[in-house]
Amino acid sequence: APTSSSTKKTQLQLEHLLLDLQMILNGINNYKNPKLTRMLTFKFYMPKKATELKHLQCLEEELKPLEEVLNLAQSKNFHLRPRDLISNINVIVLELKGSETTFMCEYADETATIVEFLNRWITFCQSIISTLT
């Protein structure tokens, strides 16, 4: 059974992930970002279902494509290089989803833009955090 300390750790990790995703979204949505049109041509894949931490597998599998899109963006839109930013997110995702169980991600048929993709995972983090508090 989860202890209060492990719940607290999970909550902090989710909050960190949430902040990273929000930072990326803000950098992309920045009105000075001339790359938005080009970035929106990239297709992202969304999970059919995202209600548990194990579903973060679906986010992990899309981190490389996310890094590619961020490589297009002006570096001044973000505090970190895309590679470092994605690496940080990857570490949190791996800790949150755990490595004990191998979960096969199921993807929805429709693709999403980077903005829709980030918003979906931001909502996921907020929803899990709310169940922990």
Epitope: P34, K35, R38, T41, F42, K43, F44, Y45, E61, E62, K64, P65, E67, E68, N71, L72, Q74, C105, Y107
Partner: antibody, heavy 121, light 113 residues
Framework: EIQLQQSGPELRRPGSSVKLSCKAS????????IHWVRHRPEHGLEWIGW????????RYAQKFQSKATLTADTSSNAAYMQLSSLTPEDTATYFC??????????????WGQGTLVTVSS | DIVMTQSPFSLAVSEGEMVTINCKSS????????????LAWYQQKPGQSPKLLIY???TGQSGVPDRFIGSGSGTDFTLTISDVQAEDLADYYC?????????FGAGTKLELK
């Protein structure tokens, strides 16, 4: 028809620099990234970097970071690459390239004919 | 960076034969979301620019003869040329375009026996 027309061969002394051009036709240069690739027969193909002509943003492979400088001029629908501090190892054919219509960055589908740069004293 | 290991270095063939060129990546090039492998194959003839033959590991580029077949997934890929023609003698390169920097294999020279 999409074409990338590159400038002619160059002979340079070690220590000097050279600027190559790549003129696009059949599409607007701001719609796609322009990549540069080096070919040396004994080393094969190496990606140098890309430029987004829309805003001049660039990305370089680490080994070319201080060797190549990519620029673009939207008014002439052309991209340029300057190579500095030339050494005999920079002797190669340099290609500019563009992605497929359906893919935003890679793979390279349209290529210039290449520019041979020879560095010799 | 992703390392692409291509083999063999060179290959001597007779017209009409079938040849296979292999390419191994240091990490998976498969994107789970669309089940596509971000690997391309190029042909380069002496004095010419490279020509895209195959992308997404198995999709033939428009106008490329169907004797060029790409296969494989994850980290192991193959370019098969069935019924080799004299005009196929060239250098062949694989390219991973999953993540920047894109990286090429060292190349395979196809020669006539």
């Amino acid at each position: 028809e999409i074409q990338l027309q590159q400038s002619g061969p160059e002979l340079r002394r070690p220590g000097s620099s050279v600027k190559l051009s790549c003129k696009a036709s059949g599409y607007n240069i701001t719609d796609y990234l322009i990549h540069w690739v080096r070919h040396r027969p004994e080393h094969g193909l190496e990606w140098i970097g890309w430029i987004d002509p829309e805003d001049g943003e660039t990305r370089y492979a680490q080994k070319f970071q201080s060797k190549a400088t990519l620029t673009a001029d939207t008014s002439s629908n052309a991209a340029y690459m300057q190579l500095s501090s030339l050494t005999p190892e920079d002797t190669a054919t340099y290609f500019c390239a563009r992605s497929l219509d359906s893919t935003p960055i890679y793979p390279f589908a349209y290529w210039g004919q290449g520019t041979l740069v020879t560095v010799s004293s | 960076d992703i390392v692409m290991t291509q083999s063999p270095f060179s290959l001597a063939v007779s017209e009409g034969e079938m040849v296979t060129i292999n390419c191994k990546s240091s990490q998976s090039l498969l994107r789970s979301g669309n089940q596509k492998n971000y690997l391309a194959w190029y042909q380069q003839k002496p004095g010419q620019s490279p020509k895209l033959l195959i992308y997404y590991a198995s999709t033939g580029q428009s106008g490329v003869p169907d004797r060029f077949i790409g296969s494989g997934s994850g980290t192991d890929f193959t370019l098969t040329i069935s019924d080799v023609q004299a005009e196929d003698l060239a250098d062949y390169y694989c390219l991973q375009h999953y993540i920047t920097p894109p990286t090429f294999g060292a190349g395979t020279k196809l020669e006539l026996k």
